[in-house]
């Protein structure tokens, strides 16, 4: 019979770290409705690709400084007469000297420095949310060439590929989330608890899953990162003829619990609780929160049916969770 | 109502291996823990294992590291334990229990197998 | 390893008394710690959870108590049905239990 919960503990994880993940169940296709939000490809999950932005600067860099056509004479005052013909093609100017790359890295440095400096007084907050793992890494043989002294200047690199090229700040990339509802009716018998699974993705507008771990046959989502999950439930709930028909008792109440690996008293969970002598014969019962999940735990709905009659929650009740971040 | 029947007294040689089994009713099986227990002839309770039948998770004592080994199959609802190597050590009666979910304490006990 | 203690491995009482049993960890258990009754015949059951908690069906004579690493069953009028042996057991880190306590009638 249901038992009312401890406290749950606030010190590091008891549990052991769990093996491999396993296999994707029949239950685990990734496949989905176009209706959901698509994978943002690499392109666009970083405003510039570094190596690109270079080579396009490579490739420009016969324009400017370095522009064939350059006049190596003085500048010429404008005359404001009318035009003449044109004359003839003039001779084959000698070739300008090719500025070495090193050069024209430095003069890069220079342009993105200064657009740094312009951003940074149009943004006094820097942004910390890109990601600046796979740019720092494909920067790295560039700002090997620079001079040691230029560390600032290639940090400063760094943060403009990192962060988006429009001002303003921007969301982080949503790594792993999902929204899934109850297929079918669960019957949950009186002084029971029930974890609920057989779970469907909705092919619906809005909808949702990114990133491994849901299991939608065993209804349990097994955290793809450590990190912060905002975790949320709402089930529909139907009341059950009571024995011997006698109204719901006072003392009568269900729990609608979000645990970590199935342990909702020694390890934190999500907790919602509701009084049943008022309640109607159909109601909503709903628990949201935060819960910190190692990689690899995971965590699913149950509810504690701690009353004297028998109740069914209802198909399209559902389970949901975002990383928030780590 | 929740019932742990586990299976009968098993009389072995030392040196063999024992498979001991323990069917769950009257729950579903698969949202929760079930740890294996040692008792020794008049002596105390000993914590072997636990297994968790939905991803087939275990943890072991250490002392019981390469001498137990637990399994589950969902489809008949039953845990297993196989002692190897057996020794006049291992002559003890042996438990199953479930693990609350909201308690996490052992609410429900095997009536424990003799070997 | 945490190491549970329970000092008194036999208690002799009379129907009516009250009863005290205790269990000493070798460390903070944070509370962590659950009582068993095993009766004469080899059955287990659960009393009490997480400390203090009364376990569905046991009658309200049971009690518990402690913090830390020290932890007592109070039975508080004995009854003959109460003639069993209880064990501690703390979830805190792994899973370890007393070594017991066998309470008789005088």
């Known amino acids: 019979s249901p038992e009312p919960g401890a406290p749950s503990r606030s010190r590091a994880r008891r549990e052991p770290p769990p093996g491999n993940e396993l296999p994707r169940g029949p239950g685990e296709s990734r496949a989905g409705p176009a209706a959901r939000p698509p994978e943002p490809t690499a392109e666009r999950a970083h405003s510039v690709d570094p190596r690109d932005a270079w080579m396009l600067f490579v490739r420009q860099s016969d324009k400017g400084v370095n522009g064939k056509k350059r006049s190596r004479g003085k500048a010429k005052k404008l005359k404001f007469g009318l035009p003449g013909p044109p004359g003839p093609p003039g001779p084959q100017g000698p070739p300008g000297p090719i500025i070495p790359p090193e050069a024209l890295l430095k003069e890069f440095q220079l342009l993105l420095k200064g657009a740094v400096r312009q951003r940074e007084r149009a943004e006094p907050e820097p942004c910390t949310c890109g990601p600046a793992g796979p740019v720092a890494a494909s920067l790295a043989p560039v700002s090997a060439t620079a001079g040691e002294d230029d560390d600032d200047v290639v940090g400063d690199v760094l943060a403009l590929l990192a962060a988006p090229l429009a001002p303003g700040p921007r969301a982080p990339r949503v790594e792993a989330a999902f929204l899934c509802r109850l297929r079918r009716d669960a019957l949950v018998e009186r002084r029971a608890l029930h974890e609920l699974g057989v779970y469907y993705l909705p092919d619906a507008e809005g909808a949702f899953r990114r990133g491994p771990g849901l299991n939608l046959t065993s209804g349990q989502y097994r955290a793809p990162v450590a990190g912060f999950y905002a975790l949320a439930a709402t089930l529909h709930v139907a009341l059950g003829e009571p024995p011997r028909r006698g109204p719901p008792r006072p003392r009568d109440h269900l729990r609608l619990l979000i645990c970590i690996q199935s342990r909702c008293q020694r390890n934190a969970s999500l907790e919602a609780i509701m009084g049943l002598e008022s309640s109607s014969e159909l109601f909503t019962i709903s628990v949201n929160g935060v819960l910190y999940l190692q990689m690899g735990q995971w965590t699913s709905v149950f509810l504690d049916n701690a009353s004297g009659c028998s109740l069914t929650v209802r198909s399209g009740s559902h389970f949901s969770a975002v990383l928030l971040g780590v | 109502q929740v019932q742990l029947q586990q299976s009968g007294p098993e009389l072995v040689k030392p040196g063999a291996s024992v498979r001991i089994s323990c069917k769950a009713s009257g729950y579903t099986f698969t949202s929760y823990y079930i740890h294996w227990v040692k008792q020794r002839p008049g002596q105390g309770l000993e914590w072997i294992a636990w297994i968790y039948p939905g991803n087939v998770n275990t943890e072991y004592n250490e002392k019981f590291k390469g001498k137990a080994t637990l399994t589950a199959d969902e489809s008949s609802s039953t845990a297993y334990m196989q002692l190897s190597s057996l020794t006049s050590e291992d002559s003890a009666v042996f438990f199953c229990?479930?693990?609350?979910?909201?308690?996490?304490?052992?609410?429900?006990w095997g009536q424990g197998t003799s070997v | 390893d945490i190491q549970m203690t329970q000092t008194t491995s036999s208690l002799s009482a009379s129907l009516g008394d009250r009863v005290t049993i205790s269990c000493r960890a070798s460390q903070d258990i944070s509370n962590y710690l659950n009582w068993y009754q095993q009766k004469p015949d080899g059955t287990v059951k659960l009393l009490i959870y997480?400390?203090?908690r009364l376990y569905s069906g046991v009658p309200s004579r049971f009690s518990g108590n402690g913090s830390g690493s020290d932890y007592s069953l109070t039975i508080s009028n004995l009854e003959q049905e109460d003639i069993a042996t209880y064990f501690c057991q703390q979830g805190h880190t792994l899973w370890t239990f007393g070594g017991g306590t066998k309470l008789e009638i005088k």
């Open positions: 997480y400390t203090s």
């Open positions: 229990a479930r693990e609350g979910i909201t308690t996490n304490a052992l609410d429900y």
